[in-house]
């Protein structure tokens, strides 16, 4: 099938990173600077993609793949590919249509983009609250309050190794 | 790659509990909370709770509220979701959902289903 | 607590646009996220934050979202897109901070 295939169409020999150039007789040409081909057979070379303003350079386009662009510091990707940049806020806020706004009482944001999340409700669980909350952080739960008899001391709780949030890009 | 794989179908009695399991590969599981949503016959989506797997913190929604424990061991990336004193509208698939990293986003990676059958 | 409407069904033509609704007092302030759901398949995530598609999800599905009306188009609609539509809020209060809309069936005729 293959050959036959070829024999057919002499643009299914062109790999990636060229295109099938009916100028030339159909002859495979290289894809033209700034341009890409990542599957072969193709009749055009595609557009390499440009990470400009607030986008930057992930990875540089090649003559087979596209560039991948990433957000400038202080903003951070959202769609398919970083389709877009949205600005970060502070940790404690969260970002509304109209802009940064810090987190009602009851309610916290340890990253810098999202909305402020409610405080766990510790006795939802049968536990008291140990460490409050604030606008950066989530109240910490300890042990039940029966647990808490006088002269029962409480231990606090090891450093969480990391916290819950930090999607890779 | 990220994956949730669940416990199977189970069958219960009306006022008897079920403990679902979810299983997390392919990334760090206390990095990200667990949400659990059910679907009954022919009914919609229904958020029941949050668990954070770092912390063990939590937030169920108000219609389940003493009836719903999510739990959670690090140690084989696993979270649980607890429904006690079973009805037969509880009869419902179960999945759990990975949060993206970030609240107030869609959850972008979820388990295959638990379907909990509460008959009599 | 927080309520977003649905319309049951939304029926089109193969090749069509399909404009799925949903309704909630001011939503255009919240951020909107929706997911197609097949019989016996888990809920997939097609569109999140009003606007923006995940990885692996085709162009001809968009969002938008202003006002009290978020809406979810599907453009050159095929049968594989014949499923149930669902949206979805988070909010900050701590009673019920998930919500999800009734669902909306798409049908190809």
């Known amino acids: 099938f293959e050959r036959t295939r070829s024999l057919q169409d002499p643009c299914s020999n062109c790999p990636a990173g060229t295109f099938c150039d009916n100028n030339r007789n159909q002859i495979c040409s290289p894809c033209p600077p700034n341009s890409f081909s990542s599957a072969g057979g193709q009749r055009t070379c595609d557009i390499c993609r440009q990470c400009k303003g607030v986008f930057r350079t992930r990875k540089e386009c090649s003559s087979t793949s596209n560039a991948e662009c990433d957000c400038t510091p202080g903003f951070h990707c959202l769609g398919a590919g970083c389709s877009m940049c949205e600005q970060d806020c502070k940790q404690g806020q969260e970002l509304t249509k109209k802009g940064c706004k810090d987190c009602c009482f009851g309610t916290f944001n340890d990253q810098k983009r999202g909305i402020c999340r409610p405080w766990t409700n510790c006795s939802l669980d049968g536990k008291s609250v140990l460490v409050n909350g604030t606008k950066e952080r989530d109240v910490v739960c300890g042990p039940s309050p029966a647990d808490l008899s006088p002269g029962a001391s409480s231990v606090t709780p090891p450093a969480p190794a990391r916290e819950p949030g930090h999607s890779p890009q | 790659q990220v994956q949730l794989v669940q416990s199977g179908a189970e069958v219960k009695k009306p006022g008897a509990s079920v403990k679902v399991s979810c299983k997390a590969s392919g990334y760090s599981f206390t990095g990200y909370y667990m949400h659990w949503v059910r679907q009954a016959p022919g009914q919609g989506l229904e958020w029941m709770g949050w668990?954070?797997?770092?912390?063990?913190?939590?937030n169920y929604a108000q219609k389940f509220q003493g009836r719903v424990t999510m739990t959670r061991d690090t140690s084989i990336s696993t979270a649980y979701m607890e429904l006690s004193r079973l009805r037969s509208d509880d009869t419902a698939v179960y999945y759990c959902?990975?949060?993206?990293?970030?609240?107030?986003?869609?959850?972008?990676?979820w388990g295959q289903g638990t379907l909990v059958t509460v008959s009599s | 607590s927080y309520v977003l409407t649905q319309p049951p069904s939304v029926s089109v033509a193969p090749g069509e646009t399909a404009r799925i609704t949903c309704g909630g007092d001011?939503?255009?302030?919240?951020?909107v996220h929706w997911y197609q759901k097949k019989p016996d398949q888990a809920p997939v995530l097609v569109v999140y934050e009003d606007r923006y598609r995940p990885s692996g999800i085709p162009e001809r599905i968009s969002g938008s979202n202003s006002g009290n009306t978020a809406t979810l188009t599907l453009s050159r609609v095929e049968a594989g897109d014949e499923a149930d539509y669902y949206c979805?809020?988070?909010?900050?209060?701590?009673?019920?901070?998930?919500?999800f809309g009734g669902g909306t069936q798409l049908i190809i005729l």
């Open positions: 668990i954070n797997p770092n912390s063990g913190g939590t």
């Open positions: 959902a990975r949060e993206p990293g970030y609240y107030g986003s869609g959850l972008d990676y």
């Open positions: 979805q809020v988070w909010n900050s209060s701590s009673d019920h901070p998930g919500v």
């Open positions: 001011d939503i255009g302030d919240k951020r």
